[in-house]
């Protein structure tokens, strides 16, 4: 199993494929968007080991930031998350895929920046209530990933200043409605709802008066919910070993998941001779786990010092969450003492501690 | 959402056997081994055995061998657990309990810890 | 078999008081094979504690478990009106899977 073919798409957000190399993308997402970037091989060839780096500087994993060969994904982004980003091979240093990003504000209705669009004499003598920015309230239906932060305005203006409130599908809408709590910014005419989940599903309405006249607009939200997935594990890890008796060998997993991750390392055994279980699965034993004072940083590393014959054979990476499990096996070969110089000298590839 | 919906209440004359099933959603019902425990009015937690769904192995435990039958349908993700020649002792409420083993492995040691429970089936046996 | 003893059996406590329970197992645990659960009357059991010392998901950081070998201990700091159930500890180190009998924490 591969990054390739393990990897979903976190959230709705739209993967944004690769320019061709010495293209720069120009792309914009809303704060609070996952952003995708994607940078298949050049001519659908093997692309080899490649790193994502952003302004000059490569990326490290993270909870957020989900890096994978061909893909990279910033959950949740902010103004932080602006920058040059590009994908290189990570042997060369060439440039395979290159994008600008630039995050703005509030992804729900084209805001501005705060402060913005507050009340202002307009120089009218009276008059009932108007739209000032009636183009930013155009998208009427707006859809989001769960855990998201909305926001609605309704910038208006009139003599005297009119007053906003709002309704959810029809009926008055108050914080207590909501276990989040709503944010009203009245000189922003603004409606904020933070980490929105499906409950939040329905038609908003602003209602702008003064008692020259009442105007109002109805907004649609849609709360897309996370599909959630299986673990995905970084392609090439754990690395097949081979060490000299007596070193220390690590096997290393990386394990990406929006739900919490359970990480395992099995060692395959035999028994009586048997590879396998009475029911043709592979027997194994757990040689680490959650257990006390373990974090998932120190799960995600396999260490064994002074190995020894018996530590020869396959180990597996396990990890999993509430919806399923991905694994990833590799080989450790265990060589004699005597023979460290002349294997060495072959294929480089001994490693003694 | 990962859930464990099990089957309704039964009740059995000594001697006869009893069927529970378990159905799995929201999650791969044939990666996750499926344990059974039960627990008698007032008392504590007794586990039964358990089933890999991927490959229909089976391991009961020692005071149930030779009268427990644990069996799986992939088709609808459902578990079943059959207790046979009951007896009054028997009467509780039977619980249908998910681990992180995952089936495509035979473990000779721990782990499973019980992380998705069914909503537990009352079997009650009187004459 | 592997025998784990809870204690005590009961517990009297108030809301915001500080409850601590007992598991003694009767040869060695891997805290690695050692959980904590929590069941309401009528409810199934629900998994609070694995790996002696971490919290499933979902679970308040109120509850908190320690301790190896054959001495552990789930601690909840501050009591609240919905933690007042039975608590049981279980190991998965050795075939069968055992439970403590259970420890009882109520209202004082």
């Known amino acids: 199993e591969s990054l390739g073919t393990e990897q979903r798409v976190v959230g709705r957000a739209a993967e944004v494929p690769g320019p061709e190399p010495g293209q720069q993308e120009q792309l914009v997402f809303g704060s609070g968007d996952a952003v995708e970037l994607s940078c298949p091989p050049p001519g659908g060839g093997p692309m080899g080991p490649t790193v994502w780096v952003k302004d000059g500087t490569g990326l490290v994993p993270s909870e957020r930031v989900l890096v994978g060969p061909q893909r990279l994904q910033v959950l949740n982004a902010s103004h932080e998350d602006s920058g040059a980003y590009s994908c290189r091979q990570r042997l060369t240093q060439r440039v395979l895929c290159h994008f600008s990003v630039r995050v703005t504000d509030a992804p729900s209705s084209g805001d501005d920046e705060d402060g913005e669009d507050e009340a202002e004499d307009t120089g009218v003598d009276t008059g009932a209530p108007y739209w000032t920015r009636p183009e930013r309230m155009d998208k009427k239906l707006l859809a989001v990933p769960a855990a998201n932060t909305v926001r609605f305005r309704c910038p208006a203006a009139g003599n005297p200043t009119p007053s906003i409130s709002w309704l959810k599908n029809g009926r008055e809408f108050r914080g207590e409605h909501r276990i989040g709590g709503i944010k009203l910014r009245h000189q922003q005419w603004s409606l904020v709802m933070e980490s929105v989940v499906p409950s939040d599903r329905g038609n908003y309405t602003c209602v702008v008066e003064n008692k020259f006249g009442s105007i109002r607009q109805t907004y649609t939200l849609d709360v897309l919910e996370r599909s959630p997935h299986r673990p995905i594990l970084q392609a090439g890890l754990p690395a097949n070993q081979t060490a000299v008796l007596g070193s220390d060998v690590e096997f290393h997993c990386k394990v990406y998941s929006d739900a919490q991750p359970h990480i395992q390392w099995l060692k395959h055994v035999e028994v009586n001779g048997s590879k396998v279980g009475p029911d043709g699965t592979p027997y194994v034993t757990v040689l680490k786990t959650a257990g006390a004072n373990t974090t998932d940083k120190e799960l995600e590393v396999l260490s064994l010092h002074n190995v020894t014959f018996e530590d020869a054979g396959e180990y597996t990476c396990l990890a999993g969450n509430s919806i399923g499990f991905s694994h990833h096996s590799a080989w450790l070969v265990v060589l004699p003492a005597e023979e460290e110089l002349v294997e060495a000298d072959e294929a480089g590839s001994v490693y003694a501690g | 959402q990962v859930q464990l919906v099990q089957s309704g209440a039964e009740v059995k004359k000594p001697g006869a056997s009893v069927k529970v099933s378990c159905k799995a959603s929201?999650?791969?019902?044939?990666?996750?081994?499926m344990h059974w425990v039960r627990q008698a009015p007032g008392q504590g937690l007794e586990w039964m055995g358990w089933?890999?769904?991927?490959?229909?192995?089976?391991n009961y435990a020692q005071k149930f061998q030779g009268r427990v039958t644990m069996t799986r349908d992939t088709s609808i993700s459902t578990a079943y657990m059959e207790l046979s020649s009951l007896r009054s002792e028997d009467t509780a409420v039977y619980y249908c309990?998910?681990?992180?083993?995952?089936?495509?492995?035979?473990?000779?040691?721990?782990?499973?810890?019980?992380?998705?429970w069914g909503q537990g089936t009352l079997v009650t046996v009187s004459s | 078999d592997i025998v784990l003893t809870q204690s005590p059996a009961t517990l009297s406590l108030s809301p915001g008081e500080r409850a601590t329970l007992s598991c003694r197992a009767s040869?060695?645990?891997?805290?690695?094979?050692l959980a904590w659960y929590q069941q309401k009357p009528g409810q199934a059991p629900r998994l609070l504690i694995y790996?002696?010392?971490s919290r499933a998901t979902g679970v308040p950081a109120r509850f908190s478990g320690s301790g190896s070998g054959t001495d552990f201990t789930l601690t909840i700091s501050s009591l609240e009106p919905e933690d007042f159930a039975t608590y049981y500890c279980q190991q998965t180190n050795n075939a069968p899977v055992t439970f403590g009998q259970g420890t009882k924490v109520e209202i004082k």
């Open positions: 929201g999650y791969t019902f044939t990666s996750y081994y």
């Open positions: 040869q060695s645990v891997s805290s690695s094979y």
């Open positions: 089933i890999n769904p991927n490959s229909g192995g089976t």
């Open positions: 309990a998910r681990t992180w083993q995952y089936s495509y492995f035979y473990y000779l040691d721990g782990g499973y810890y019980f992380d998705i």
């Open positions: 790996g002696a010392s």
